[in-house]
Interface confidence: low
């Protein structure tokens, strides 16, 4: 037989706390134990679960755990079943809630001298006792026309008066604990002797010299007083008006009228109502003077036919905010259609050429009206007046290519040369009418030119080929003065180009024929071995049939090219001593010698007392200093050629002689000793 060793028993439990219903069973065979709640099997959850044979509660819940629990033991082999005694919880709890109006039905019905009942929605088991508070101060029964019982959750105010106004809250406590109202109730019962607003003044905006009216009314029993003040607290009455409010009138109903308003009347007006009791009520309203600023200028607009475009009109700053509308040809635009106004925008849909013209944006308010025009151009695709033609241009002269077009607006013309955009410079110039000028035509200008004429509506283009008529010229012109080295082979070239290949020949300027050792080979003058007699003036003549002939004069000089007889050597000198850098050159014409020291030419007229260049070309530096160290270059030149050679100069401290060294010991390096 199945025997219950421990049976569950009814017990007190606290909401949200732990609890345990015990059940222990003894039986001959294996049994399984489960629990019933009001006859239905109990499913395990995290909150309520079987612990062995007992039922454990992690947190008692007054709603889910109310009812009768029973422990059931069953032998699945024999089918025998035993049930324990019933057990239930006496759950103690308390739960906060709001303070609500029970009577009358709505706040709007609360009047002075009516009964008001408030209810405290705090519930619990066992039944809690209640405490009421007004503005945080506890209320006790029988004081100041109210009824409250600690057992009752209701607070009755009979009759309710202004002195009962305040924030009502409640708290309740029981054996379980304490809770206070989750939402409180504000009771507001007006004192009829307090001033109340009936009509409040509103801000107004008026134009200069117009009139402004502020309305203001209060009510109370007995009737309240009403006073108007301006900005600086100056009272306004019909008897005493401040100097700047001479045109103010206060009416019996409290309204304030200001006539012929001026800028100094703008500001804050205060209407003050004062009842027999209670604080004054101060209402403020501002008088603004209407104003309107100027409108920004429009840039002219260019649109293309068939497109949709919008022009935004920025309204000027103003008070009140200006209204905006668009007009065209004196007619206000509609709010729909093909050309219409949308908000502040002018909308042109599917633009036609006839839409071009002046459109005006108007803005207006109480202060006045402003307007601004925008000029709208409807662009057309350019058409040709004169296309560029294939042209023959003469080398060295200015050349012109036309590109004359017409369109609205005036088209922009750009030129391309070999598909490369021509940027205007000293050689190219594009005139306003589109014509291209090539200032001085060169051979390589012979190529393809293309002009493109554009407006926002589209572009057209045409191209032309330029052929350059080449002039007869030396390429390059021979140098007018040339040198030949004595006793050596020499050549003097001369070449020319023209529309036809020119023939080239040399002759002596005096008309005499060339010696047999001098040959003229296709324009190159060749000297097999230069003699002194070969010096003189020669003329190169280039000619062809259509262009005639041209001449170039060349003066040939025979020279012995420069060689150095003496070259400067690497030199080391003691500080304070004298350095000598020798240099001697020969040649015909006799070469001149210049020195360059530390990257600058040494001007013989500006050398100073320490330096001197001798007639033979040598350079002497007295009293040398460390800063004189560096590379020195000897440059030899005449009218025919130039040569240079260089050597370093080192300036060193004179060593102090050691004991062991005799007076005749040589220095440790090659020195100039002076």
């Amino acid at each position: 037989a199945i025997v219950f060793i421990k049976q569950p028993s009814s017990q007190d439990a606290l909401q949200g706390r732990r609890a345990l219903l015990r059940c222990e069973v003894e039986a001959p065979g294996p049994v399984h134990v489960y629990w019933l709640l009001d006859g239905a099997p109990v499913q395990d959850t995290e909150r309520r679960f079987a612990q062995g044979s007992s039922l454990s509660f992690a947190a008692v819940d007054r709603l889910q755990d109310s009812g009768t629990f029973q422990c059931v033991a069953r032998d699945d082999v024999t089918g025998e079943e035993a049930r324990s005694a019933n057990a239930s919880f006496n759950i103690k709890w308390i739960e906060a809630g709001p303070v609500v109006l029970k009577h009358p039905a709505s706040e709007a019905e609360i009047q002075p001298q009516t009964q008001v009942t408030l209810r405290c929605h705090i519930d619990g088991h066992p039944r809690p006792t209640y405490q009421w508070f007004r503005d945080g101060t506890p209320l006790s029964d029988g004081q100041s026309n109210h009824t409250v019982s600690s057992k009752e959750r209701n607070l009755t105010l009979r009759p309710a008066g202004p002195e009962h106004s305040g924030l009502y809250s409640c708290c309740a406590h029981s054996a379980f604990g304490q809770a206070c109202s989750s939402q409180n109730f504000t009771l507001s019962i007006a004192d009829e002797s307090f001033a109340r607003v009936v009509l409040a003044p509103q801000d107004v905006v008026v134009a200069r010299y117009e009139e402004a009216m502020f309305h203001c009314q209060f009510s109370a029993q007995p009737p309240p007083s009403l006073q108007w003040l301006f900005e600086d607290e100056t009272p306004i009455t019909n008897r005493s008006r401040p100097p700047h409010l001479r045109r103010a009138t206060v009416f019996a109903n409290g309204s304030l009228l200001l006539t012929q308003v001026r800028p100094r009347n703008a500001g804050i007006y205060r209407c003050i109502g004062q009842g027999q009791r209670g604080p004054p009520i101060i209402l403020e309203a501002t008088l603004h003077l209407a104003e309107i600023e100027d409108m920004p200028l429009f840039e002219p607009r260019v649109f293309t036919a068939g497109s949709e475009e919008r022009v935004t009109c920025l309204p000027p700053k103003g008070l009140p905010e200006p209204s905006v509308w668009w007009e065209h040809a004196g007619v206000r635009l509609p709010t729909h259609g093909r050309v219409y106004q949308k908000g502040h925008e002018l909308v042109l849909a599917n633009i036609a050429e006839s839409d071009a013209g002046v459109y005006t944006c108007h803005a207006a308010n109480l202060a006045g009206q402003r307007r601004q025009d925008v000029n709208i151009t409807v662009a057309t695709v350019p058409s040709w007046l004169k296309k560029p033609q294939d042209s023959q241009l003469e080398e060295g002269k200015p050349g012109y290519l036309d590109c004359l077009t017409q369109a609205t607006p005036k088209p922009t013309v750009v030129w391309y040369r070999n598909q490369m955009l021509i940027s205007e410079d000293s050689r190219f110039e594009v005139f306003k009418n589109g014509t291209l000028r090539i200032n001085s035509v060169e051979v390589y200008d012979g190529t393809w030119y293309r002009c493109m004429s554009s407006t926002p509506a589209g572009s057209i283009e045409a191209q032309a080929r330029v052929q350059v008529l080449e002039k007869l010229k030396f390429t390059p012109p021979p140098q007018p003065q040339q040198c030949m080295e004595f006793d050596k082979e020499a050549t003097v070239p001369c070449s020319a180009t023209g529309r036809e290949k020119p023939t080239i020949k040399w002759e002596r300027a005096d008309g005499s024929s060339l010696p047999e050792w001098v040959t003229d080979n296709a324009g190159t003058l060749h000297f097999a071995r230069v003699t002194r007699d070969d010096a003189g003036n020669y003329t190169c003549i280039a000619s062809n049939g259509p262009q005639g002939q041209i001449r170039a004069h060349v003066q040939l000089t025979v020279a012995v090219f420069i060689t150095f007889k003496v070259e400067p050597e690497r030199t080391t000198v003691y500080q304070g001593h004298t350095a000598l850098l020798q240099c001697e050159a020969q040649g015909d014409p006799k070469p001149l010698i210049q020195w360059k020291g530390k990257d600058r030419i040494l001007d013989p007229t500006k050398l100073g007392p320490r330096m001197h260049i001798f007639q033979n070309g040598s350079l002497v530096i007295h009293d040398v200093a460390p800063e004189d160290s560096g590379r020195y270059t000897c440059i030899a030149g005449n009218s025919c050629n130039i040569k240079h050679t260089e050597a370093p100069l080192y300036v060193v401290d004179k060593p102090v002689p050691e004991e062991s060294e005799g007076p005749g010991s040589p220095p440790p390096y090659k020195m100039i000793q002076t």
Epitope: E308, R310, T312, L314, P315, S323, V324, T335, H336, G337, Y340, K342, G343, H344, E345
Partner: antibody, heavy 119, light 108 residues
Framework: QVQLQESGPGLVKPSGTLSLTCAVS?????????WSWVRQPPGKGLEWIGE???????NYNPSLKSRVTISVDKSKNQFSLKLSSVTAADTAVYYC????????????WGQGTLVTVSS | EIVLTQSPATLSLSPGERAALSCRAS???????LAWYQQKPGQAPRLLIY???RRATGIPDRFSGSGSGTDFTLTISRLEPEDFAVYYC?????????FGQGTKVEIK
């Protein structure tokens, strides 16, 4: 005060046509306002679809222009949106809104209706 | 079309802090033609600011707008719990009307 209410099927098949209507209450569709459609794909931003005036004038977003038709029915005080050749990318909450008569901000808006494009 | 770029994409702040939301336009927008909207999950956008700086009816004065040209800012001086939402800027000065991609203001 003007209130707007969208209505129409919540599910449209791909390549089909999405059709929505916006009923205007508390004011006349013949006022000087323009009436717009705006959409918002799930978890994304807002995209303006187009607008209509009571005369029938329309403006559309160029990105949708080829597929959108907005019409107005003054007798019923409502305006409608048709979007053809829909794909899953057209799945969105569709809002109707009134544009301010002097400027073009949107206020008020309808509460929006979710349209899903799926087979 | 005018592209509006909002930054940051997300702003994590605590109630009581100040929020500054940026909206940058790809080309100049007249200040008369920029609006800000607030959108909470499952709701339609709500107009906050129009004309770049004018508060719509019933909008608390902790919301303010500023800016001109290509740079505009929406400032919330002290964040209240109900201000955590997504904010969009919109230009209505040229067609098509365009919106920014939104800035989400979330609780830190």
């Amino acid at each position: 005060q003007v209130q707007l209410q969208e209505s129409g099927p919540g599910l449209v098949k791909p390549s089909g046509t999405l059709s929505l209507t916006c009923a205007v209450s508390g004011g006349s569709i013949s006022s000087t306002n323009w009436w717009s459609w705006v959409r918002q794909p799930p978890g994304k931003g807002l995209e303006w679809i187009g607008e209509i005036y009571h005369s029938g004038s329309t403006n559309y977003n160029p990105s949708l222009k080829s597929r959108v038709t907005i019409s107005v029915d003054k007798s019923k005080n409502q305006f409608s949106l048709k979007l053809s050749s829909v794909t899953a990318a057209d799945t969105a909450v569709y809002y109707c809104a009134r544009e301010d008569s002097n400027y073009d901000w949107f206020d008020p808006w309808g509460q929006g209706t979710l349209v899903t494009v799926s087979s | 079309e005018i592209v509006l770029t909002q930054s940051p994409a997300t702003l994590s702040l605590s109630p009581g802090e100040r929020a500054a939301l940026s909206c940058r336009a790809s080309q100049s927008v007249s200040s008369s033609y920029l609006a800000w909207y607030q959108q909470k999950p499952g709701q339609a956008p709500r107009l906050l600011i129009y004309g770049a700086s004018r508060r719509a009816t019933g909008i608390p004065d902790r919301f303010s707008g500023s800016g001109s040209g290509t740079d505009f800012t929406l400032t919330i001086s002290r964040l209240e719990p109900e201000d955590f939402a997504v904010y969009y800027c919109q230009q209505y000065g040229s067609s098509p009307r365009t919106f920014g991609q939104g800035t989400k203001v979330e609780i830190k």
